[in-house]
């Protein structure tokens, strides 16, 4: 369908658009160019625009959408937008979002199989472990740092935090009641589904029902399939069959070659996407703005307590990480955030980890020169367990609520915050209604009244949003990690620990180790077994 | 050891004002919030809300919001009750209750309380 | 708002005896259930926090127990200065409620 690209006098690809508006191949140097913005000359900034078109209209996109929400807001009168008109100022945005959720099942069980499969089993197992290790360490810090931050700008003793028109019956209604033990119950039923094909579209999920058992009312759980793609149980079933895929050796590659097709066919989908993303992000964030009610007296009411969440998600996410990443690979992480602008864009219009998958992935891949097997295997995984952003705020949350309602919080208790904090963010996907109710539960494991999660919800569409960026560059920088962890365990041992996706190209030729410093550079042995010819993955757009 | 000592009875017009203090003793005064109960004559108790002694800020209950003000002042560790301008219904004895920095709402100390009769 | 129902909002007993009184919330509370004894004239006074954990220099005779919607104080030895009103109390949600007393008379 597409043709093959021009080649130079070297043989190699002349550098050409690709999907998401980087360079699909270039120099060293206009990599640079391109990822940290070096440009000089005339010709050079046209390239260097040229090659970040699609992160400029992104960030675009969402001022624009900002601007655009507190101008529709602002002008009222006939402007002003009932229910019915908001849901079509939506719609671009809406439609964004089902482009997306679209792409989210085939990307992640394709991309999870065609990964597992093509490790094996002792890489997978360091590699996964590595992973969870550092989702692990990280959302811990992210905890950690919000309790800190709460601590110090107190926001719930802040005396615009709350006000006399604050009901004191609060949202005894709106907070979920529901026992600790059986949320992470449902976490472990989420985790093996017992129907795959409901699990694209539902959860596992207690309720519980009164019942009069001699003369005494009990409240009894009762499971029930909620709304809602089970999508822990996708992961861990789509890891194990990758897994035994590659057990099966010849008998498995033509089902591991269709995974990866369709996974590639995917991908192609996603890069279309992506050009529609700026589009859907901007009436996304408009939309939201202008749904708000009275966003300045929520602000001038939580303003401490936005900023607490805010500022700890910028310390967290454009200091910790950052330096984590560096102390580990000694590479720039600002340049490596650079080349995931468009999925933090997406993420913050979106507030969705996983409808971002699909551009992070193709991003990392592209941008980042993270491999595919790695990238493929590693980001559903973040997507689905590293919540660093939904742990800090629900730290910052459960600090907010205990000086808001003057409740002592000593040592113990703030150790039971974090430790709760972490694991009811990593099994936050696992347990429908996520956000709220891993926040009721941390609550539950102090003793904390419940009351002000209403005042929480009042601002959850703009805390979300940062939480979910946050969320997602946890997972790049983790991929980024594992990439340079992989480079360093493969260039010290003469064999490969891992193996390539393997349908890159046509069935028959494998690939070498491709090029150093740049990943998108693959050199194939030609017909005439010559290591000369270069090819480069098709670029659809 | 934690006291809290409250002002006298009252006697009261309607449509008089009344402020009822309740000075704090024995802790620190500004790390626990500090509730208001109404005992209307023979019969329960009715919490009226409470005021966050650091930040100062009222939550009034659902009855009790209008002609009701919850105030502070820290520099004497006394929290205040005030009603604008009483009824008959007011008639009951009003107590202040140290609100526990644990286990969500319960009242851990006292005021011997204040009686407000209201006649005419 | 969540009711508290106590029973029986009068009983007679002797020095001695073991009493039980019991408090019914109108949805699951969670465990916080607290019990103040009142006598007249006086101010209530913390006896039970949290469904059975004993208030400082409240003496061990008091107990509480129950889960979900229904609890229980119970005086293991009726002593003289126990005849008082007894209060129960939630504390899970805002605004806290008390149940309406139970008047505990000399036999």
């Known amino acids: 369908m597409v043709a093959d690209p021009p080649r130079d006098s070297k043989g190699l690809a002349a550098a050409e658009p690709t999907a998401n508006g980087g360079l699909a191949l270039a120099s060293i140097e206009d990599q640079g160019a391109a990822a940290g913005g070096y440009c000089g000359s005339r010709d050079q900034v046209r390239r260097c625009l040229r090659a970040n078109l699609l992160v400029l209209l992104t960030v675009v996109a969402v001022v624009a959408g900002v601007a655009l929400g507190l101008g529709v807001s602002g002008a009222g009168g006939a402007l002003a937008l009932g229910p019915e008109r908001l849901s079509a100022f939506v719609f671009p945005g809406e439609l964004l979002l089902r482009l997306l959720r679209m792409i989210i099942l085939p990307l992640v069980v394709c991309s999870l199989i065609g990964g597992a499969a093509s490790l094996d089993p002792g890489a997978l197992g360091r590699l996964g472990a590595w992973a969870l290790l550092f989702f692990l360490v990280t959302t811990l810090l992210a905890s950690a740092l919000g309790v800190g931050l709460a601590l110090a700008l107190q926001p719930g003793a802040a005396s615009a935090a709350i006000n006399a028109s604050v009901g004191a019956a609060g949202s005894a209604e709106n907070a979920p009641s529901k026992e600790v033990l059986d949320s992470f119950l449902d976490l472990a039923r989420n985790i093996f589904p017992s129907n795959l094909v409901s699990a694209a579209f539902r959860s596992y999920s207690t309720t519980y029902e009164e019942r009069n058992i001699t003369g005494t009312r009990v409240k009894v759980p009762v499971g029930q399939e909620v709304e809602g793609m089970n999508i822990l149980g996708l992961v861990v079933f789509a890891i194990v069959f990758g897994v035994a895929l590659r057990k099966l050796g010849p008998e498995g590659e033509l089902l591991i070659r269709f995974f990866n097709s369709f996974n590639e066919a995917t991908m192609v989908l996603v890069s279309w996407i992506m050009w529609y993303a700026p589009v859907g992000i901007m009436f996304l964030v408009a939309g939201k703005i202008v749904e708000m009610e009275d966003v300045g007296l929520l602000f001038a009411r939580l303003g401490k307590y936005i900023l607490c969440c805010l500022l700890g998600h910028a310390i967290h996410g454009l200091l910790v990480l950052p330096l984590i990443y560096f102390l580990f690979t000694r590479k720039n992480p600002y340049r490596f955030l650079w080349g995931i602008v468009t999925p933090l864009a997406t993420a913050f219009g979106t507030s969705s980890s996983s409808a971002t998958l699909p551009l992070m992935m193709k991003c990392v891949e592209e941008n980042n020169g993270v491999a595919k097997h790695i990238s493929r295997f590693i980001l559903p995984i973040g997507a689905t367990v590293n919540m660093d952003g939904a742990a800090l705020f629900q730290c910052v949350a459960a600090v907010f609520i205990a000086q808001l309602s003057q409740q002592s919080l000593d040592f113990v208790k703030i150790i039971t915050i974090l430790v709760t904090a972490t694991a009811s963010s990593v099994g936050a996907a696992g347990i429908p209604a996520g956000g709220v109710l891993t926040l009721a539960i941390i609550l539950e494991a102090v003793n904390l009244p419940v009351d002000h999660i209403s005042l929480i919800l009042a601002v959850d569409w703009l805390v979300d949003r940062s939480c979910t960026v946050l969320n997602v560059e946890g997972d790049a920088l983790g991929a980024g990690l594992l990439q340079n962890y992989v480079d360093r365990t493969e260039s010290r041992s003469t064999e490969p620990e891992l193996i390539q996706v393997k349908s890159e190209l046509p069935l028959d030729p494998l690939p070498v180790p491709t090029e150093e410093g740049n990943p998108l550079l693959k050199h194939y042995r030609g017909p005439a077994g010559d290591a000369t010819v270069a090819s480069e993955k098709e670029s659809v757009m | 050891q934690i006291q809290l000592v409250q002002s006298g009875p009252e006697l009261k017009k309607p449509g008089a004002p009344v402020k009822i203090s309740c000075k704090a003793s024995g802790y620190t005064f500004t790390t626990f919030g500090m509730s208001w109960v109404k005992q209307a004559p023979g019969q329960g108790l009715k919490w009226m809300g409470w005021?966050?002694?650091?930040?100062?800020?009222?939550i009034y209950g659902d009855d009790f919001k209008g002609r009701f003000v919850f105030s502070l002042d820290t520099s004497v560790s006394t929290a205040y009750l005030q009603i604008s301008s009483v009824k008959a219904e007011d008639t009951a004895t009003y107590f202040c209750a140290r609100r526990s920095d644990n286990y969500r709402y319960f009242f851990d100390y006292w005021g011997q309380g204040t009686t407000l009769t209201v006649s005419s | 708002d969540i009711q508290m129902t106590q029973s029986p909002s009068s009983l007679s007993a002797s020095l001695g005896d073991r009493v039980t009184i019991t408090c019914r919330a109108s949805?699951?509370?969670?465990?916080?259930l607290n019990w103040y004894q009142q006598k007249p004239g006086k101010a209530p006074k913390l006896l039970i926090y949290y469904t059975s954990r004993l208030h400082s220099g409240v003496p061990s005779r008091f107990s509480g127990s129950g889960s979900g919607t229904d609890y229980t104080l119970t005086i293991s030895s009726l002593q003289p200065e126990d005849f008082a009103t007894y209060f129960c109390?939630?504390?899970?949600?805002?605004?806290?409620?008390f149940g309406q007393g139970t008047k505990l008379e000399i036999k």
């Open positions: 949805q699951d509370i969670r465990n916080y």
């Open positions: 109390q939630q504390g899970h949600t805002l605004p806290p409620t």
């Open positions: 005021i966050h002694t650091y930040a100062g800020v009222p």
